[in-house]
Interface confidence: low
Amino acid sequence: RRRRRDTHFPICIFCCGCCHRSKCGMCCKT
């Protein structure tokens, strides 16, 4: 899993089924 912190504060994680259960992509938690 890749993690990154961008300049606008959200922590974004590339994962599957996190932001949407059936898809993989960047899920950002503010």
Partner: antibody, heavy 118, light 110 residues
Framework: QIQLVQSGPELKKPGETVKISCKAS????????MSWVKQAPGKGLKWMGW????????TYADDFMGRFAFSLETSASTAYLQINNLKNEDTATYFC???????????WGQGTLVTVSA | DIVLTQSPASLAVSLGQRATISCRAS??????????MHWYQLKPGQPPKLLIY???NLESGIPARFSGSGSRTDFTLTINPVEADDVAIYYC????????FGGGTKLEIK
């Protein structure tokens, strides 16, 4: 640009079968799932389920298990909705729809009206 | 299944006034810091149009008269000021657990 183009209106009798097509363009077809949404006359929107365009695996909402089938022709970037043993209550406009990652549906077909009448 | 209840079922608003539509979910639609609630406008003979995504984000090309707010189970779509072209049915939709739509709210001009 992203487009979803559906097949034309259908007039069917009870007990018959209908198959609606939805041709996608402007994006990689297998990257996004395809949902189907029903709007019966004078009624609200009802999500019927979706098909994973990468694996071909369909998921059906509870009310649409049994007579309904989602399928794909990946080489033609086309999704299909088939309804078997048509009933009067299947009279509706059916939309194919492509969402974005968080599940918001930003792209819609124009809708296909299916009329079931003896 | 998550059930979405919209209120009111219909409302009539004078041109230039504010319209407020509520959507209540039977359980939270929040996950990973996101609210998986979206709003659509439906006009006769047209497909639905996405207005607001993830509770409060304005879709590209949609006028800033439309705004959304809320979290967990309670969400609001606001149109201010209302214009004649806004006559339509408005639906909320959740995508936290599969998808479901609310029952719709019909907006008319008083």
């Amino acid at each position: 640009q992203i487009q979803l183009v559906q097949s034309g209106p259908e007039l069917k009798k009870p007990g018959e079968t209908v198959k609606i097509s939805c041709k996608a363009s402007g994006y990689t077809f297998t990257t996004y799932g395809m949902s189907w949404v029903k709007q019966a006359p004078g009624k609200g929107l009802k999500w019927m389920g979706w098909i994973n365009t990468s694996s071909g695996v369909p998921t059906y909402a509870d009310d649409f298990m049994g007579r309904f089938a989602f399928s794909l022709e990946t080489s033609a970037s086309t999704a299909y909705l088939q309804i078997n043993n048509l009933k009067n209550e299947d009279t509706a406009t059916y939309f194919c729809a492509r969402d974005r990652y968080y599940g918001e549906v930003a792209y819609w077909g124009q809708g296909t009206l299916v009329t079931v009448s003896a | 299944d998550i059930v979405l209840t919209q209120s009111p079922a219909s409302l009539a608003v004078s041109l230039g006034q504010r319209a407020t539509i509520s959507c209540r979910a039977s359980e939270s639609v929040d996950s990973f810091g996101n609210s998986f609630m979206h709003w659509y406008q439906l006009k006769p003979g047209q497909p639905p149009k996405l207005l607001i995504y993830r509770a409060s984000n304005l879709e590209s090309g949609i006028p800033a008269r439309f705004s959304g707010s809320g979290s967990r189970t309670d969400f609001t779509l606001t149109i201010n000021p209302v214009e004649a072209d806004d006559v339509a049915i408005y639906y909320c939709q959740q995508s936290n657990e599969e998808y479901t739509f609310g029952g719709g709210t019909k907006l008319e001009i008083k």
